[in-house]
């Protein structure tokens, strides 16, 4: 099966790497301009110089392109807790992140927020934190596993998934109160 | 078909509380963070709140933080925006909108039709 192509692409591979389609003259191939510049004006003829300018502040492109205009710098998200890595040169966007000991949680594939590292207090540190993925912990006894804390077994209601983990727990509170009403 | 249909907006005073719902259909609710994002009349949308599959993690827009609590029944396939003192700047139609899990100029893939809430003595 050969795969679908779209126009640009069609175009493109009509000439050779690094070279596009004229758009108003497909006999004609065009050198690509380099990363931090996008075209001004296609090359007039073959064998001439495409019209490339450098990007203005605040726009970047970070391949060889044909593009018309330069991409617009991304902002990093203050609202989401996030700090800017590297700020935006004409051929590299700003890189975004979180602060030391955070990791992202990402919301969709372009949309991450910054959350603070579980310390694991009352358990210990199953798998360290990670840029993506926070600390797993694994809890002392007396103490379950809840939305990555360790909270205490008292806590623990019997309709919650921590029955299991408690069950010693709930038994000896049941016994206690059991024994008082002799 | 995914739809996303809004209940619960309407009129109440200042001070007052509003719970939304948000019944999904047509995908598997379970898998996907969840959002509800608002437009007050001749204004840009805004970001209110988003729960992620489990429900664990959640993000609240600095205006409505301590006010609004996000929450969802994945076992009935719905969000729920439970709304306390309310202000009249909360005015807005509320939409539930669905995150998309693919690279797409909007992060959101679906959104429900609305419901309006406005907050007025």
């Known amino acids: 099966l050969v795969p679908h192509l779209g126009d640009r692409e069609k175009r493109d591979s009509v000439c050779p790497q690094g070279k596009y389609i004229h758009p108003q003259n497909n006999s004609i191939c065009c050198t690509k301009c380099h990363k931090g510049t996008y075209l001004y004006n296609d090359c007039p003829g073959p064998g001439q110089d495409t019209d490339c300018r450098e990007c203005e502040s605040g726009s970047f492109t970070a391949s060889e392109n044909h593009l018309r205009h330069c991409l617009s710098c991304s902002k990093c998200r203050k609202e989401m807790g996030q700090v800017e890595i590297s700020s935006c040169t004409v051929d590299r966007d700003t890189v975004c992140g979180c602060r030391k000991n955070q990791y992202r949680h990402y919301w969709s594939e372009n949309l991450f927020q910054c959350f603070n590292c579980s310390l694991c207090l009352n358990g210990t540190v199953h798998l360290s934190c990670q840029e993506k993925q926070n600390t797993v912990c694994t809890c002392h006894a007396g103490f379950f596993l809840r939305e990555n804390e360790c909270v205490s077994c008292s806590n623990c209601k019997k309709s919650l998934e921590c029955t299991k983990l408690c069950l010693p727990q709930i038994e000896n509170v049941k016994g206690t109160e059991d024994s008082g009403t002799t | 078909e995914v739809q996303l249909l809004e209940s619960g907006g309407g009129l109440v005073q200042p001070g007052g509380s509003l719970r939304l719902s948000c019944a999904a259909s047509?995908?598997?609710?379970?898998?996907?963070?969840m959002a509800w994002v608002r437009q007050a009349p001749g204004k840009g949308q805004e970001w209110v709140s988003f729960?992620?599959?489990?429900?664990?993690?959640?993000y609240y827009a600095d205006s409505v933080k301590g006010r609004f609590t996000i929450s969802r029944d994945n076992s009935k396939n719905t969000l729920y925006l439970q709304m306390n003192s309310l202000r009249a700047e909360d005015t807005a139609v509320y939409y539930c909108?669905?995150?998309?899990?693919?690279?797409?100029?909007?992060?959101?893939?679906?959104w429900g039709q609305g419901t309006l809430v406005t907050v007025s003595s």
């Open positions: 909108a669905k995150f998309s899990v693919r690279f797409r100029s909007s992060i959101f893939d679906y």
């Open positions: 729960i992620s599959t489990g429900g664990h993690v959640t």
């Open positions: 047509g995908f598997t609710f379970g898998e996907y963070n």
